[in-house]
């Protein structure tokens, strides 16, 4: 079976406040009403789930309250923001999209976005 195509940027640099945003776009083969988006982090050949949200088309994405992710959706495009990132969180962040309803179920996995996080230099003590 052909996989659903998912596109995401190759590289994103997190802000000095540890926030990274990127767009995950999927080529929907059908008229999905319910979509699940999962962000996976791949580092040292290990894959872990960062966050996930199921949303109804036309509605907002709702991540769990303690999630480090937020997002908005527009058509077949999801704008994802990951917060609280530190240098040790640098890695490949993969967008996985599933069309949950109605059938047929489709799964698409992006190639990943390499997010670089640089911890800010501590401010030197000012002599005033």
């Amino acid at each position: 079976c052909k996989a659903m195509h998912v596109a995401q940027p190759a590289v994103v640099l997190a802000s000095s406040r540890g926030i990274a945003s990127f767009v995950c776009e999927y080529a929907s083969p059908g008229k999905a009403t319910e979509v699940r988006v999962t962000v996976l982090r791949q580092a040292d050949s290990q894959v872990t789930e960062v966050c996930a949200a199921t949303y109804m088309m036309g509605n907002e994405l709702t991540f769990l309250d303690d999630s480090i992710c937020t997002g908005t959706s527009s058509g077949n495009q999801v704008n994802l923001t990951i917060q609280g990132l530190r240098a040790m969180d640098t890695g490949l962040y993969i967008c996985k999209v599933e069309l949950m309803y109605p059938p047929p179920y489709y799964l698409g996995i992006g190639n990943g976005t390499q997010i670089y996080v640089i911890d800010p230099e501590p401010c030197p003590d000012s002599d005033f």
Partner: antibody, heavy 124, light 107 residues
Amino acid sequence: EVQLVESGGGLVQPGGSLRLSCAASGFTFSSSSMHWVRQAPGKGLEWVSGISGSGGSTSYADSVKGRFTISRDNSKNTLYLQMNSLRAEDTAVYYCARYLMSFNLTRTSWFDVWGQGTLVTVSS
Amino acid sequence: DIQMTQSPSSLSASVGDRVTITCQASQAISNYLNWYQQKPGKAPKLLIYDASNLETGVPSRFSGSGSGTDFTFTISSLQPEDIATYYCQQGDAWPWTFGQGTKVEIK
């Protein structure tokens, strides 16, 4: 073991109501799309209604739209079919079925687990 | 909705015979065609998905082929336990629809 067990069938008069239940076990019910498929005596299979894992999306065959309501309680691992304004032509064995959403397959389009069915007879 | 037409509606064959059932879709459905077996008084059981893939645990005497609008289901050597009605189901366009079934009996 993955299992679906239907209940709630029986004899009902035309215009009456009935609520079918389907108890699920052995799999993650809340992430599975669930469906009702019926089979009239001596006839073929007809998809009736379906619901997404979250319960947020539903769909119905034209023949039951406006009369039947599908719902689920993920805390109880149970699927329901509320049938109102029943007609003689609704007489059938009603099966609940899991629609496979396999996370190592990129597209799926089949029912992989079925219950044993419950008979609904609409007659005066 | 896509219409599925199965033939024959019933057949009788001897143990060991090769049995073939065909299923035709009213429009092209790629390879999104599944086959189920239903024994008397029992629920349907998935045998083949996506036209030719054997479900886990299903004997290799069952096979399927085809794409587009024309599909074939074959039992290479009929066994007494294969007495059942067989249904095709299209999985290309929602809602899924089934063929009317083919009843297989032993001579």
